[in-house]
Amino acid sequence: WELTILHTNDVHSRLEQTSEDSSKCVNASRCMGGVARLFTKVQQIRRAEPNVLLLDAGDQYQGTIWFTVYKGAEVAHFMNALRYDAMALGNHEFDNGVEGLIEPLLKEAKFPILSANIKAKGPLASQISGLYLPYKVLPVGDEVVGIVGYTSKETPFLSNPGTNLVFEDEITALQPEVDKLKTLNVNKIIALGHSGFETDKLIAQKVRGVDVVVGGHSNTFLYTGNPPSKEVPAGKYPFIVTSDDGRKVPVVQAYAFGKYLGYLKIEFDERGNVISSHGNPILLNSSIPEDPSIKADINKWRIKLDNYSTQELGKTIVYLDGSSQSCRFRECNMGNLICDAMINNNLRHADEMFWNHVSMCILNGGGIRSPIDERNNGTITWENLAAVLPFGGTFDLVQLKGSTLKKAFEHSVHRYGQSTGEFLQVGGIHVVYDLSRKPGDRVVKLDVLCTKCRVPSYDPLKMDEIYKVILPNFLANGGDGFQMIKDELLRHDSGDQDINVVSTYISKMKVIYPAVEGRIKFS
C-alpha cells in the first residue's frame, strides 16, 4: 500500500508568492511559493495519486504583514481552502498568546491540529480541551494512518504560551500516544512536529512504532540529487535513521516559507512496515501556475493589507541582507541597520561628560526574519519592515554588568553553525570569536564603544562595570536562551515598538546604505 505525504513547514505567513529568498515578490515571473501556487501542485498530485495526505509541521504564524493584520485568521482560511489534513503546532503559533491561537486558528480550522507534548493545566485545560489533539487517526483510501504531533519543548523560551501550558519532552510524551495508536490497531504512524531536525532524528531513533517523521523548526533542506535553487541540502531526502529497534525510519523537512512542497512516497507492507521511501521537495517556481480561484481570494484579502502599510518610508541603495543564512552566522548589514536605528532612537545628550547615555546594541539574529531587495526602486515600506521584524516587540534599555554581556556573547556562539537564532548582531561593539575553542570560551576579544568620551572609541569590556545596552524585549525576557540577561539585568526600561524605531530612522535618513564593517570577526 502506497502513501503520498505532501508536507510544508515554517511557512511564516508567506501566503503570497515571494522572491527566491522568500522576501516580498518583486519580479512576478521569477517568484515562488504562495498558497495559490501550492494549491495547483497539491491538486495536481491529488488527481494523479490515490492516497495523499497534506500535512503542515508548524509555524504558519508570524512573518509578514498578513499575520500582522489578520493575526491567524488568514492561516485558518487558506489552510481550510487547501484542505490540509493535519497540522502540528509550532512555537510561533503562540506568539499572540494562547488566545491568539485558540480563536483565529483552533476554532476555525477544519483539520486537526496536533501536539502530544503540550499539556494544558488550570482553567485553560477545559477551555482548550478538544481544540488540539495529541494524535488523529485519518482514513486514507481503504486504510487508516495515525498522525501524532509534537512541538518544541523550548516554546516557552521562544514564544508566549503563558503559564497554563506545559511543554514536555517530545520523546517521553510521544511514546504513550504511539502505544495507544498501536492498541487501536493503527499500524501506520507519522510523527508530525516542530522541534528541529536533531529532535526529528531522535524521535525516529527512539520512539517505537513511528514509521515516518515529518518535521519543521530548523528550516532544514534535504534533497537527493542536484538541488533546484539556492538552498544547500543538509542531507538526502528522505533522511534515513535506523531506529533502536532496527527499523529504517525516513525523516523529512521542506525548508521553509512555502518555497517547496515536500513530496514523500512511502510503501507499506500489509503489517504497516515501511518497505520503501523516496521523493524530494518540489520547488514551487513560476513554472507552476497560481490557482486562479485561490489567487482571487488572496487578492480579496490583500486589499486590507494595501491600506495598512504601503507608503514609502525611505530608500535603500544596497541589498539589506536579512537572510537567516547570513544573520545567524555572521555580521549582516540588516543587523547593523537595525542596531544603528536602535541607538539613534536613544540619543539623549545628557551632559558634557557623555556624548550619549548608551552606545551599545545587541540583537538576536533569529529575530531578523527577511531581507529587503534594493531592486524594487530602493523603496522601503512599513510592510517590508513588518516582514523583517514581524514580532511586534519593543527595543528596550537595560543595564548589565560586563560579565553578563560576556556570557551573552559566549551563548551567541555556544552551538554555532546550526542556524540557531541566538547569534548576536551588534552595534557599538566589536567582538572576535575563535570557534576552535570549546563552547563557553570562544570570545577572544570584546571591545565596547565608550560613552563617557567626546570622541567615541572602542575599549575592552570591563567585567565589573555596569553598561547600558539597547536590545529587543525578547532578549531582556531571556528569549533564545539568554537566561543570563533576564537573571542578571540590573535595570530594564521598556522602549518603543521595533518597526517604528527602524521606520523612524529610515524616514530620518531618507537614503540608507548599511555595510558589513567588521563589527563581528572570527579569528
Partner: antibody
Framework: EVQLVESGGGLVQPGRSLRLSCAAS????????MHWVRQAPGKGLEWVSG????????GYADSVKGRFTISRDNAKNSLYLQMNSLRAEDTAFYYC????????????????WGQGTLVTVSS | DIQMTQSPSTLSASVGDRVTITCRAS??????LAWYQQKPGKAPKLLIY???SLESGVPSRFSGSGSGTEFTLTISSLQPDDFATYYC??????????FGQGTRLEIK
Amino acid sequence: EVQLVESGGGLVQPGRSLRLSCAASGFSFDDYAMHWVRQAPGKGLEWVSGISWHSDNIGYADSVKGRFTISRDNAKNSLYLQMNSLRAEDTAFYYCAKDGPRYRGSYYYFDYWGQGTLVTVSS
Amino acid sequence: DIQMTQSPSTLSASVGDRVTITCRASQSISNWLAWYQQKPGKAPKLLIYKASSLESGVPSRFSGSGSGTEFTLTISSLQPDDFATYYCQQYNSYSPITFGQGTRLEIK
C-alpha cells in the same frame, strides 16, 4: 458609536417576498461577519442567517434554507435579507446583529444589535 | 443541530439576591457560549462571551462559568435593573448558531 438600523419590514401576504436592509455605521463594516436574528412576538430568539466578512461563509437556519438569501454590500456598509415564499411562522421582529471578533470565517456572538424591524405575514 | 436548554424558565428573586441561571448543551461546545439580557421591547444586549469573559461596560456582578456542556450565569447581587429575560447562545465551530429558550427573571 456603532449603529445598526434595520428597514424594509411590514405586512406581507403568505407566499410573497420582502427584502430587509440593515445600514451599519461606527465600525469597519467589512471586517466583521453580520447576522439576522428573529424573535416571534412573545417568543425566544432564533438565529436566521449569517455571512462572513468576506462573504465566503454563508449560513442559514434549517427553517429558512432555500427561501431566504443573505447578502452584503461592503461598499455601502449594508446587510440584506431577501425573504421569499414567506409563511405565517416567519412573523417576527428581525434584528440585524454584528459578530464579535473580526476576520473570522465562522460565527461567534453578537456584540451589537439593531432595534429590529417587524415582519408580519398574514392574509 | 446543537440544542441549548435553559433552566429555570422563570425565576423569581428579590433585589440583593444571588441568582444563577443554567444552560445545558446537547453536546460539548468547549467554552463557545454567550449570554444576553433582553428587556421588553428592546434588542438583546451581550453580557458574557466565551463562557466567562465579561463584555466591556457590563457590571461586574454578572459572571459566567462552565465548559463542555454545563454553563451558568450568576448575578451576585440582584439590582432593580436586572429584571429581564436572559438567553444563552452557543457558537461552536461551524455549527448553526442556537439559543436557549430563555429564562425570565421576575421580581418576587
